[in-house]
């Protein structure tokens, strides 16, 4: 019979509001009180196995004791009522769990969406955490009919998908009830026609058609989602070139009504574009669909928009009365080629004489010409047509080039090598810039580029390497032929030399020594050599440093001590730092020449 509890706690399963006060009462049973010779004075209250201070107890009568908590802040309290029996032994009477939390807040921001082909889903903001099991019920009704409640699942308490099919063009009223052990609240009611909450499926079967007549347009066609039979649609069309990451957008006013095609204008010829489209209800009430699958299309070719860059080289070793000329040109970049270049057409006209035509697939043509003046023209051809002609005058053999550019400068900036000059007074058709890497190991093989006659500053468009010396030549080209070339050396980025100079003695005296060295080879300079430093010392003395101008190749050390071993080394410096050469030793003689001890 003692398996029966000795008493009970009231209330049995309390749920209380956080930060509120709470009182529990423990009532002892008579039989227990008799058995253990105790009364309410013997009751000890504990929470989570810790004894509660006596100040919180109230003895109500001989059988009942209460305990009061103020400002409850724990979510779960294990509360036990215990009695002190014989010899102060603690005997558990009863235990309860006090659960604390908060009543639900009024759900806010209730909104609903009808995904095409699916049932209506509503979601809301449930407010603060209650720490209690809280049930959310979505309620909906027509003026004449109540729909079944939609009970939110525990793992998704802020949304619910209704069980009934959506009916358009009839207003529905929707609200949410939130309920837990501490209370029940209702959201504001919203009243709407589900047609204004539609999220259509994206348009599908998006495809792209190009036009043979216009290289700047592509037509998109698509299949509209089925919801088109219920609502009118508007669209958002975006496009980008295949290699771009940012999208351009068709102005919304151009796509503001139901359609199944659209022609995109102002595109670049022979360029691959990527398109995507989404749609929503025409009046903007509802939701945008997801994006369609992307579709690609290539605009049609257009004739090349620019003549290729065109230049020539004359072989210096030429037979009597003839010279070998290499005509050369650059491939047009895609945005100027406007299609696949099929071939190039070159014409050569001797002064007031016959015409020679060549069709070439390469970007160079070698011809044997007499010593007369020639006019060469070059056009690039694609499927649609030919470019404008590039015209080049190859002057006669006795032509004297004049009028060079002035104040030629070259400098690195923003990881590019810039060249600038002052334009000659005469009218320049174009400029040819040639550049090559100066090297002791290999010949200077030039790359080149062409600039308009109005340009006086540009950067070299090539794969330039750091710490290489570039010889840059600028030639103005006039109507009657090329002007005088001007050249300058430059580095994209300097570095310290990879080797220092090797110093040697040219002549050694009792108190001086003439040192000499060779200029560093250009391949190891890695920049402009600005100066040298000579370091010399005796075995026991301090090192002395002497700066020497980079134009010198010898230097005289004076005030040396006779009959002394000297160690000398030399460093060369660019703008980016220096590099020491090997150390060299020499000994001054004990006596000057002709001097006797």
């Amino acid at each position: 019979e003692l398996l029966d509890p000795c008493g009970y706690i009231s209330p049995e399963s309390p749920v209380v509001q956080l930060h509120s006060n709470f009182t529990a009462v423990c009532v002892l049973k008579e039989k227990c009180m008799d058995y253990f010779h105790v009364n309410a004075n013997y009751i000890v209250w504990k929470t989570n196995h810790f004894t509660i201070p006596k100040e919180q107890y109230t003895i109500i009568n001989r059988t009942a004791s209460s305990v009061t908590f103020t400002d409850i802040s724990s979510l779960n309290i294990q509360l036990t009522c215990n009695i002190l029996t014989f010899g102060q032994l603690e005997q558990n009477v009863y235990g309860i769990t006090i659960i604390s939390g908060l009543p639900p807040e009024k759900p806010k921001n209730l909104s609903c969406i009808v995904n095409e082909g699916k049932k209506m889903r509503c979601e809301w903001n449930r407010g603060r955490e209650t720490h209690l099991e809280t049930n959310f019920t979505l309620k909906s009704e027509w003026a004449t009919h109540k729909f079944a409640d939609c009970k939110a699942k525990r793992d998704t308490p802020t949304s619910c998908t209704v069980d009934y099919s959506t009916v358009y063009f009839v207003n529905i009223e929707v609200w949410v009830e939130a309920e837990n052990a501490l209370g029940k609240v209702t959201s504001d009611h919203i009243n709407f026609d589900p047609v204004y909450k539609v999220k259509p499926n994206p348009p599908h079967n998006l495809s792209v058609i190009n036009s043979e007549e216009l290289s700047s347009i592509l037509k998109l066609t698509w299949t509209n989602p089925s919801i088109k039979s219920v609502i009118r649609l508007k669209y958002n069309i975006q496009y980008r070139t295949k290699d771009a990451s940012t999208w351009s957008q068709i102005p919304p006013e151009d796509t503001a009504s139901t359609r199944s095609s659209f022609t995109v204008q102002d595109l670049k010829p022979f360029t691959e574009y990527v398109f995507r489209i989404c749609c929503m209800k025409e009046d903007g009430k509802g939701y945008w669909s997801d994006w369609s699958e992307e579709a690609n299309g290539i605009t049609y070719e257009d004739r090349p928009s620019k003549a290729p860059s065109f230049w020539y080289k004359i072989d210096p070793s030429h037979a009597q009365g003839y010279r070998t000329v290499q005509l050369m040109w650059k491939t047009l970049p895609p945005f100027e080629a406007n299609g696949k270049i099929l071939d190039y057409e070159v014409t050569l006209t001797r002064w007031k004489s016959h015409l020679q035509n060549y069709t070439v697939n390469d970007t160079k043509l070698t011809v044997n010409l007499t010593n007369d003046r020639y006019v060469a023209t070059l056009t690039a051809r694609n499927l649609v047509g030919k470019s404008d002609a590039a015209v080049l005058t190859i002057p006669a053999c006795d032509f004297q080039a004049t009028h060079p550019v002035m104040d030629l400068k070259a400098f690195p900036k923003d990881n590019m090598l810039w060249v600038e000059w002052t334009t000659p007074r005469e009218s320049v058709k174009k400029y040819i810039l040639e550049w090559c890497v100066l090297s002791d190991k290999a010949p200077c093989i030039a790359d080149w580029q062409q600039e308009d006659g109005t340009v006086h500053r540009t950067h070299l468009r090539g794969n330039l390497a750091e710490s290489k010396c570039y010889l840059i030549t600028v030639t103005p080209v006039y109507a009657d032929g090329p002007g005088s070339p001007e050249s300058i050396k430059a580095y994209l980025k300097q570095a310290p030399p990879s080797k220092g100079p090797t110093v040697r003695t040219k002549k050694v005296g009792k108190n001086e020594a003439v040192l000499e060295w060779d200029q560093l080879p250009v391949d190891v300079q890695n920049g402009f050599i600005r100066n040298y430093t000579i370091f010399y010392r005796t075995i026991i003395g301090n090192e002395t440093a002497v700066n020497v101008d980079s134009s010198h190749t010898e230097y005289t050390l004076s005030s040396l001590t006779s009959d002394t071993l000297y160690m000398v080394r030399m460093a060369a410096y660019t703008d980016e730092g220096g590099k020491d050469g090997p150390e060299f030793t020499f000994t001054t003689p004990k006596f000057a020449q002709g001097e006797i001890e």
């Epitope: 036009s211 007549e213 066609t221 299949t223």
Partner: antibody, heavy 121, light 108 residues
Framework: EVQLVESGGGLVQSGGSLRLSCAAS????????MNWVRQAPGKGLEWVAY????????DYSDSVKGRFTISRDNAKNSLYLQMSSLRVEDTAVYYC??????????????WGQGTLVTVSS | DIQMTQSPSSLSASVGDRVTITCRAS??????LNWYQQKPGKAPKLLIY???SLQSGVPSRFSGSGSGTDFTLTISSLQPEDFATYYC??????????FGQGTRLEIK
């Protein structure tokens, strides 16, 4: 020379079916959208159906939706119109037309010579 | 759907006359408007596309103008072969593509 030639028209009973064909020549058929347009005797022009150049997108006028099917075979340079559940009001000359476009319009050029479909009650 | 209304429905004119046919759209269609000519027993033939562009091979006496909702087809000097039915057609908001009801041009 760009040419469109329709065939397959004729007399059919109400509720019956008919398949019209259009043979295209003189242009790259697979590059163009195609349409069927009809003209009832003594009446104006009415657009019937559209198909994109690849055949993935098709559209129909409300009056034929669910009864007519437009299709194409680019390998054969052919356009088709399968007509079923025909009604007396479907009686018309049916034209096969090529659709062209610019940035500022879409238009029909050329038109076939037409094929007459007569639906009797 | 966009409705196209042509006026007049029919008109009589003489060779050499200047003739104007108008077409009105029920909503703005930008320049997505085309004109066709149809002679009895023949298929329609494109005259003007994109409101004002003359189709290749069409005589220059035909011209088109307008934008938005109001469009005009003008024949500057009527020739005997111009007596036919003329249709306007919109391709702005499609489907459906819609035609005007036609204007019958007869010899006076």
């Amino acid at each position: 020379e760009v040419q469109l030639v329709e065939s397959g028209g004729g007399l059919v009973q109400s509720g019956g079916s008919l398949r019209l064909s259009c043979a295209a020549s003189g242009f790259t058929f697979s590059r163009y959208e195609m349409n069927w347009v009809r003209q009832a005797p003594g009446k104006g022009l009415e657009w019937v159906a559209y198909i994109s150049n690849t055949g993935t997108t098709r559209d129909y006028s409300d009056s034929v939706k669910g009864r007519f099917t437009i299709s194409r075979d680019n390998a054969k340079n052919s356009l088709y119109l399968q007509m079923s559940s025909l009604r007396v009001e479907d009686t018309a000359v049916y034209y096969c037309v090529r659709e062209k476009f610019s940035g500022t319009s879409d238009w029909f050029d050329p038109w076939g010579q037409g094929t007459l479909v007569t639906v009797s009650s | 759907d966009i409705q196209m209304t042509q006026s007049p429905s029919s008109l009589s004119a003489s060779v050499g006359d200047r003739v104007t046919i108008t077409c009105r759209a029920s909503q703005s269609i930008s320049s997505y408007l085309n004109w066709y000519q149809q002679k009895p027993g023949k298929a329609p033939k494109l005259l003007i596309y994109a409101a004002s562009s003359l189709q290749s091979g069409v005589p220059s006496r035909f011209s088109g103008s307008g934008s938005g909702t109001d469009f005009t087809l003008t024949i500057s000097s009527l020739q005997p072969e111009d007596f036919a039915t003329y249709y306007c057609q919109q391709s702005y908001s499609t489907p459906p593509i819609t035609f005007g009801q036609g204007t019958r041009l007869e010899i006076k």
